[in-house]
Amino acid sequence: AFGISGVQKYTRALHDSSITGISPITEYLASLSTYNDQSITFALEDESYEIYVEDLKKDEKKDKVLLSYYESQHPSNESGDGVDGKMLMVTLSPTKDFWLHANNKEHSVELHKCEKPLPDQAFFVLHNMHSNCVSFECKTDPGVFIGVKDNHLALIKVDSSENLCTENILFKLSET
């Protein structure tokens, strides 16, 4: 819900970080929408899931995502780049056994079926924004965020702190 600092030199710290507990500190179902109130929806097509960003018709039910929050412990870092300590990480699962994954090679966001323990590609550092929106930074590729591109979710590189408030990487979570 709140202010973000800027893209820091997360690379080493994020790659070295470990999830401190196998259990999430909390998890709940929420619908995910963009800054411009478009809904994130999930559709099963040819035995795989597709992710869409679209305007829902009035009274159309929003898809829910299970968000699981984990505490990540970084190694101590005295370099002053703002990255050591405990961070809040999240996984997103729209349906049983499927999780959002960052495909860094293709710059895409995909749904993969997998078992626990989940791979690093399924974890995103949660950033709360001052506009009561959130953004999701790839654990495996610091400075890269889930964003909206051509009515799909994609991975978007954010290279300066000014760009952290760009609308295409901001998302809203709601109970309805």
């Epitope: 819900a1 709140f2 202010g3 973000i4 600092s5 800027g6 820091q8 997360y10 500190i25 909390t26 709940y28 929420a30 929050y69 505490e71 970084h74 101590s76 870092n77 005295e78 002053g80 780049d81 703002g82 990255v83 050591d84 300590g85 405990k86 961070m87 809040l88 550092v125 949660l126 950033h127 709360n128 001052h130 009561n132 702190s161 979570l173 109970e175």
Partner: antibody
Framework: QVQLVQSGAEVKKPGASVKVSCKAS????????ISWVRQAPGQGLEWMGW????????NYAQKFQGRVTMTTDTSTNTAYMELRTLNSDDTAVYYC???????????????WGQGTLVTVSS | DIQMTQSPSSVSASVGDRVTITCRAS??????LAWYQQKPGKAPKVLIY???NLESGVPSRFSGSGSGTDFTLTISSLQPEDFATYYC?????????FGGGTKVEIK
């Protein structure tokens, strides 16, 4: 261990300003944000705003916007809260509190300063 | 702003009693709720974060539950050092807001 040590009590006249300090130790100061919370005598807690120690990014509660300034000095690991145009309603204990998580503000605190009593009286 | 309503505002109890304090948010806050204990002249101390997570070093007689709008802090067996004022705080959206407090007094 993590410690937040605040400056001593202040007595101010209405219309004056006060600047409270919060010296951090036991962790990398630039990794975490600091919030300021106040408590009037016999009353509840009120969040005033937040500062990111790393780059000075601030977010103030609307009630204090234009009257409060939060700053940090990374060379001394100290956060400051200045409140201007004081009136008797500002008589309170002012606390600094550290974010539980680094990297971004999530509104969760783990460590608090001991508090600074600011009395506004003519 | 999200209003946080705590009840009761005060409770008289004896050592060994089970004490329950509730906190209601004016709108859903998922699990983003913390509980604090405050003694006179002291800073608040975190007991529970994210609705149900016990802060390190806090005795296991304290527990938290709830999500959405309704939350509970339970002290399973009140100890002499537990007589204090307890506050809830929502961390879901700005501005952060606190409940009005519940004073736990000796019967």
């Amino acid at each position: 261990q993590v410690q937040l040590v605040q400056s001593g009590a202040e007595v101010k006249k209405p219309g004056a300003s006060v600047k409270v300090s919060c010296k951090a130790s036991g962790y990398t100061f630039t990794s975490y944000g600091i919030s300021w919370v106040r408590q009037a005598p016999g009353q509840g807690l009120e969040w005033m705003g937040w500062i990111r120690a790393y780059n000075g990014y601030t977010n103030y509660a609307q009630k204090f916007q234009g009257r409060v300034t939060m700053t940090t000095d990374t060379s001394t690991n100290t956060a400051y809260m200045e409140l201007r145009t004081l009136n008797s309603d500002d008589t309170a204990v002012y606390y600094c509190a550290r974010d539980r998580y680094s990297g971004s503000f999530h509104g969760n605190f783990d460590y608090w300063g001991q508090g600074t009593l600011v009395t506004v009286s003519s | 702003d999200i209003q946080m309503t705590q009840s009761p505002s005060s409770v008289s109890a004896s050592v060994g009693d089970r004490v329950t304090i509730t906190c209601r948010a004016s709108q859903g806050i998922f699990s983003w709720l913390a509980w604090y204990q405050q003694k006179p002249g002291k800073a608040p101390k975190v007991l529970i974060y994210a609705a149900s997570n016990l802060e390190s070093g806090v005795p296991s007689r304290f527990s938290g539950s709830g999500s959405g709008t309704d939350f509970t802090l339970t002290i399973s067996s009140l100890q002499p050092e537990d007589f204090a004022t307890y506050y809830c705080q929502q961390a879901n959206s700005l501005p952060l807001t606190f409940g009005g407090g519940t004073k736990v007094e000796i019967k």
